[in-house]
Interface confidence: low
């Protein structure tokens, strides 16, 4: 009897291990979204970027939702959020409207329940992109650890969107869940 | 009988907890590699950096391999990758070849099975390092969440390698596994 | 008897799942600390920033301690550390002491057992903030994966503290535990 119980326990514990591993490691939400260059707004004003890829190249998403330009949280938790934004200009694109630029990114959180938007992270630089150089480039990286609730939305705002680098390795943002909320 | 079974279950569950904790938390791959300043290439061209420390100071590696200048993935999974690259120049080092610099980093993934190299992340800035200032410094940080397969290799390319800051707190890259692949 | 044992096992395994989930996901240390603007040092020298929020807005802490301007590790482990530091200046604040600035951040680790301080990460840039522009801005982001022992302290040093951006989305640092030490 005792031997039978041990065997049964080993079998149950083994299947539990599989179940626990699967539920723990496969349900963990994440997203890595890359810029969709076919629909970058023009101008130098600050805009919300709504066109991102979620399913090609490096872009991917799991247990989160991408809709209307926003990354929607499906599962409460603490997440690490990050964004990498590259700006560039070449003289062949024509003269800049101004050589003094404010190149900025804002990672914002919007709550549907309480309709309000808050900036979680910002970064950037003022730049003097003089006509003495034919090519200019600048990248911003921000990252941080935030409590996110189901239904909250993450979006990206930038200044000077017409200067964005459209490569998937250049302009992207993402999130991955690290921890449950107590 | 019932009491004996409970005691045995507690004992098995306890050891299972230890086992599960160990297998989950100790086998998770990671690396933090710091620049090996004894072998930084000269020049201003774009090069792959092949000399990194993996076992001294802040540098460390576990369940990943460092070989031929590349960080090799041993375990399929989703990883957070990051790099911090610092450039600096002091007038005592002599004049720069050009005051207009493109200081860049590219984090690349190479697959041996399909011999091809792809840039996962890039960052940097064009800089005007004028002779009016005796010291110049600039740092780049990039990070992102990527699916990596066993055997794939991560490497770092930079422009102007001769300007790299050789400190372990300045120029480094790394990765840690966050999640299994479904 | 066998049916009773199975039922009992299911009950115990179920409670074990709850326990394991709680112990794993709720005890994981983290912190996200935002600048306390009421107490930013003046001047252009390099200083340790001691005033941070840990319990308002985006700021939060769990299973770590904030004391005397330092983030104290309570649990051995491998942690991902990050910092985002923003500097800004508007002409209405008066002229800068110098237009040539070194805007830097240093993330340091201090061990009480061996009273010594080491820089884990640094980043920044030399900047020429000319009087031709009324507003200047620059952000630094650094991040990396480090082994931290209970009792070790993380602190932030910056140059030109009087230029810090006091917003919670601008100037912050944090950590979260990723993995146990083998």
């Amino acid at each position: 009897g005792s031997q039978h119980i041990r065997a049964e326990k080993a079998m149950v514990d083994g299947s539990w291990l599989d179940l626990a591993k699967r539920s723990k490691l496969e349900a963990q939400p994440f997203a890595h979204l890359t810029i969709n260059a076919t629909d970058i707004p023009s101008g130098s004003h600050k805009v919300s970027l709504s066109s991102w890829y979620h399913d090609r190249g490096w872009a991917k998403i799991s247990n989160m939702t991408f809709s209307n330009g926003k990354l929607i949280v499906n599962q409460d938790g603490f997440y690490y959020l990050y964004a990498n934004i590259c700006f560039r200009h070449h003289e062949t694109s024509g003269d800049l409207a101004t050589e003094y630029l404010q190149l900025m990114v804002y990672v914002t959180k919007t709550s549907i329940k309480i309709p309000s938007s808050h900036t979680l992270m910002k970064g950037g630089s003022t730049k003097y992109w003089s006509g003495n150089s034919e090519f200019h480039f600048y990248s911003i990286n921000v990252g941080g650890f935030f409590k996110l609730r189901s239904g909250e939305e993450i979006s990206i705002e930038v200044s000077n969107p017409s200067l964005l680098d459209p490569d998937q390795d250049a302009t992207y943002f993402g999130a991955f869940k690290v921890r449950d909320i107590d | 009988g019932s009491q004996h079974i409970r005691a045995e279950k507690a004992m098995v569950d306890g050891s299972w907890l230890d086992l599960a904790k160990r297998s989950k938390l100790e086998a998770q791959p990671f690396a933090h590699l710091t620049i090996n300043a004894t072998d930084i290439p000269s020049g201003s061209h774009k090069v792959s950096l092949s000399s990194w420390y993996h076992d001294r100071g802040w540098a460390k590696i576990s369940n990943m391999t460092f070989s031929n200048g590349k960080l090799i993935v041993n375990q399929d999974g989703f990883y957070y990758l990051y790099a911090n690259i610092c450039f600096r120049h002091h007038e005592t080092s002599g004049d720069l070849a050009t005051e207009y610099l493109q200081l860049m980093v590219y984090v690349t993934k190479t697959s041996i099975k399909i011999p091809s190299s792809h840039t996962l992340m890039k960052g940097g800035s064009t800089k005007y390092w004028s002779g009016n200032s005796e010291f110049h410094f600039y740092s780049i940080n990039v990070g992102g969440f990527f699916k990596l397969r066993s055997g794939e290799e991560i490497s770092i390319e930079v422009s102007n390698p001769s300007l790299l800051d050789p400190d372990q707190d300045a120029t480094y890259f790394g990765a840690f596994k966050v999640r299994d692949i479904d | 008897g066998s049916q009773h044992i199975r039922a009992e096992k299911a009950m115990v395994d179920g409670s074990w799942l709850d326990l394991a989930k709680r112990s794993k996901l709720e005890a994981q240390p983290f912190a996200h600390l935002t600048i306390n603007a009421t107490d930013i040092p003046s001047g252009s020298h390099k200083v340790s920033l001691s005033s941070w929020y840990h319990d308002r807005g985006w700021a939060k802490i769990s299973n770590m301690t904030f004391s005397n301007g330092k983030l104290i590790v309570n649990q051995d482990g491998f942690y991902y550390l990050y910092a985002n530091i923003c500097f800004r200046h508007h002409e209405t604040s008066g002229d800068l002491a110098t237009e040539y600035l070194q805007l830097m951040v240093y993330v340091t680790k201090t061990s009480i057992k061996i009273p010594s301080s080491h820089t884990l990460m640094k980043g920044g840039s030399t900047k020429y903030w000319s009087g031709n522009s009324e507003f200047h801005f620059y952000s630094i982001n650094v991040g990396g994966f480090f082994k931290l022992r209970s009792g070790e302290e993380i602190s932030i040093e910056v140059s030109n503290p009087s230029l810090l951006d006091p917003d919670q989305d601008a100037t912050y640092f944090g950590a979260f535990k990723v993995r146990d030490i083998d």
Epitope: F135 | G43, K46, Y100, Q102, I114, S116, S159 | -
Partner: antibody, heavy 115, light 108 residues
């Protein structure tokens, strides 16, 4: 402007190096591509090189073609040449580092592979 | 790789000609169009799928994104007689040829 040189007649199995030089801009600050065109045929991209290093090649060109650069030139070395490599070889400057648009082209240099 | 159609097209002066280019995978808007006349190197006309290069007349137009792209010449003049090529500018990894096969435009 850019200009290619080094073309001419070469026998099958031979090796030839073409050179691209520039005037009016610095080669060292620009990404450069090599493209070829067989007589009466279309354009065929060979490969490109970043400012200062790291060449990339079309799949078919890997192994036999090598792109390198000095501070003043961008070179294309071709080995084990066959009659199918007979073409006009163009050097072209990209619009910017990382942008694959070819903005300034040289007039080309003719390479003839024949016995 | 890039599939360009048609291989050849005739158009009358004042008419309109349309050339298509299909990518084997999505390339966003990373596409260029070039014009090449006999004995000359190619000339960049359009980049970013639809942006005219400096000095290029507005009668040349590019459109499309993803995998399907179109190049149109309206109000055709005799000087438009040339061969036109599309070129993907999305990736230089694992490429056989970045260029389409070309379209010869004959002006009657």
């Amino acid at each position: 402007s850019v200009k290619e040189s080094g073309g001419g007649l070469v026998t099958p199995g031979g090796t030839l190096t073409l050179t691209c030089t520039a005037s009016g801009f610095s080669l060292s600050n620009n990404a450069m591509s090599w493209v070829r065109q067989a007589p009466g045929k279309g354009l065929e991209w060979i490969g490109y090189i970043y400012p200062g290093g790291s060449p990339y090649y079309a799949n078919w060109a890997k192994g036999r073609f090598t792109i390198s650069r000095t501070s003043t030139t961008v070179d294309l070395k071709m080995t084990s040449l066959t009659t199918e490599d007979t073409a006009t070889y163009f050097c072209a400057r990209h619009v910017s580092d990382g942008g694959w648009y070819l903005y300034i082209w040289g007039p080309g240099t003719l390479v003839t592979v024949s016995l | 790789d890039m599939i360009q159609t048609p291989a050849s097209v005739e158009v009358a002066v004042g008419g309109t000609v349309t050339i298509n280019c299909q990518a084997s995978q999505s390339i966003g808007s990373n596409l260029a169009w070039y014009q090449q006349k006999p004995g000359q190197p190619p000339k960049l006309l359009i980049y970013g799928a639809s942006t005219l290069a400096s000095g290029v007349p507005s009668r040349f137009k590019g459109s499309g994104s993803g995998t399907q792209f179109t190049f149109t010449i309206s109000d055709v003049e005799c000087t438009a007689a040339a061969t036109y090529y599309c070129q993907q500018a999305y990736s230089i990894s694992n490429v056989d040829n970045a260029f389409g096969g070309g379209t010869e435009v004959v002006v009657k």
